[in-house]
Interface confidence: low
């Protein structure tokens, strides 16, 4: 079986080899990386190019997002005939080179992950000395960040009619399934899931009256673990205490 | 031209563990990743995870976790994977591929092993 | 993870005859992959990023399709097309199959 494109099966991993004439631009990537929260992902990129022997100035580049226009996440620049590649940026000390551009190669290690991080990943190499010329990854690699639930909010609000209402919302991925209970709600009452616009990993849910005083607690739940936090509810004189 | 050499049919008892390997030759085994499959009658194809032996990096489908490992050895163009406490839903034909991860999202398994037949039985 | 459904699980055609078969995904993808298994072999890729054909493959076979739902069409069917046909997703983790069509040739 052949492919209809070039296969480049030259070593990528020896400088010593000479590339085919017919060698061209192109990068490996995987589709998604998956890791969980707290932990370090690396993200692939192997590449190879149409220039012989380049030795001169180079630059790796990877970006989030958006190819082409999405911000840089890492940087680093290589001098002439030199392998060490100096990091002129790493957002928030956390992105690191694992690969060695001049061996093609521009692998990247991402510590300390957060959900944050889960978005597309682009990586990039420019050439700059007697051969100008860059490529970057059209499709990049998906990195998938999941992550056991963690309550980020629990309240008591007032509602009209002298009512209350209690909201829970928590992050986590998959995104956690939420559940009250409480008072007169029974061993537990499931809510409805709503992830809020823009917020993927954020699921809120509401209980729309509170009819007794007492602990009320919401639980998230997802395959990675559970989270539970509480919220009191004392009406005295028409005031309502609420504590976590 | 590009080969990829699986090893032999293996019989098996429950609760214990096998390993099989996976040869390359004709390409530079460093510059692609391995994938393995899974294929049960009436159950299709399963993918089981891939390896890129030049970065030792593994992607593994979380259903096969704590199931399948894999590894690859640079010194001799050999992937493997091993599956351990076998039960009878392990019993399969298992393939491995190359998988070519090209530029423009065109992702594919574009050569296949013979595959490697494993019967768990007591 | 991305469910794949083919249908029909199993096709009978003459030789001649334009054959269809589709797949759909329980989830929107950007690419369908086709591949062709006779038995006792290994699967072969035959179509990649939905349209394309791979080396070898004969310009009878068509494949297309978006979103959820992609088809491999032959528009003559010849006595060697007999195989199963499984369609695959690499858009997220983990990477799924379809059950298969099973193609036979009256």
């Known amino acids: 079986f052949v492919r209809t494109k070039i296969d480049t099966t030259e070593n990528l991993l020896n400088t010593e080899v000479h590339s085919s004439p017919a060698q061209r631009w192109s990068m490996q990537v995987p589709p998604e990386v998956s890791a969980e929260a707290g932990d370090a992902a690396v993200l692939p990129c192997t590449f190879t190019h149409p220039h012989r022997h380049y030795d001169g100035p180079l630059t790796a580049i990877w970006r989030a997002g958006e190819p082409y226009a999405g911000p840089q996440v890492f940087r680093c620049a290589a001098a002439r005939g030199s392998e060490l590649c100096q990091t002129a940026l790493s957002l928030h000390g956390r992105f690191r080179l694992l690969g060695n551009p001049r061996r093609n190669d521009l692998s990247l290690r991402v510590e300390r992950l957060a959900l944050a991080d889960d978005r597309r990943y682009f990586c990039r190499v420019e050439f700059a000395g007697d051969v100008h010329d860059r490529y970057e990854s059209r499709h990049g690699v998906r990195l998938h960040v999941t992550a056991a639930p963690r309550i980020v909010n629990i309240s008591v609000l007032p509602s009209p009619a002298h009512a209350f209402r209690a909201l829970c919302t928590a992050e986590g991925e998959p995104p956690p399934a939420l559940a009250w209970s409480g008072p007169a709600l029974g061993n537990s009452l499931a809510a409805v899931r709503s992830p809020r616009e823009g917020h993927g990993h954020l699921v809120t849910a509401e209980l729309p009256a509170l009819t007794h005083d007492g602990r009320y607690t919401c639980t998230a739940a997802n395959s990675l673990g559970r989270s539970e936090a509480s919220v009191y509810l004392f009406r005295f004189h028409g005031a309502s205490g609420a504590s976590t | 031209q590009v080969q990829l050499q699986q090893s032999g049919a293996e019989l098996v008892r429950p609760g214990t563990s096998v390993q099989m390997s996976c040869k390359a030759a004709g390409y530079t085994f460093t510059n692609y990743w391995i994938g393995w499959v899974k294929q049960r009658p009436g159950h299709g194809l399963e993918w089981v995870g891939d390896i890129h032996p030049g970065i030792n990096y593994t992607n593994n489908n979380e259903k096969f976790r704590g199931k399948a490992t894999l590894t690859a050895d640079t010194s001799s163009n050999t992937a493997y994977m091993q599956l351990r406490g076998l039960t009878s839903d392990d019993s399969a034909i298992y393939y491995c591929?190359?998988?070519?991860?090209?530029?423009?999202?065109?992702?594919?398994?574009?050569?296949w092993g013979q595959g490697t037949s494993v019967t768990v039985s007591s | 993870q991305i469910v794949l459904s083919q249908s029909p699980a199993l096709l009978s055609a003459s030789p001649g005859e334009k054959v269809t078969m589709t797949c759909r995904a329980s989830s929107s993808v950007s690419y369908m992959y086709w591949y062709q298994q006779k038995p006792g072999s290994s699967p072969k890729p035959w179509i990649y990023?939905?349209?394309n054909l791979t080396s070898g493959v004969p310009a009878r076979f068509s494949g297309s399709g978006s979103g959820t739902s992609y088809s491999l069409t032959i528009s003559r069917v010849e006595a060697e097309d007999a195989a199963t046909y499984f369609c695959?997703?690499?858009?997220?983790?983990?990477?799924?199959f379809g059950g298969g069509s099973k193609l036979e040739i009256r």
């Open positions: 695959q997703q690499w858009n997220s983790k983990p990477w799924t």
């Open positions: 591929a190359r998988v070519d991860y090209d530029y423009d999202g065109s992702y594919i398994m574009d050569y």
């Open positions: 990023a939905t349209s």
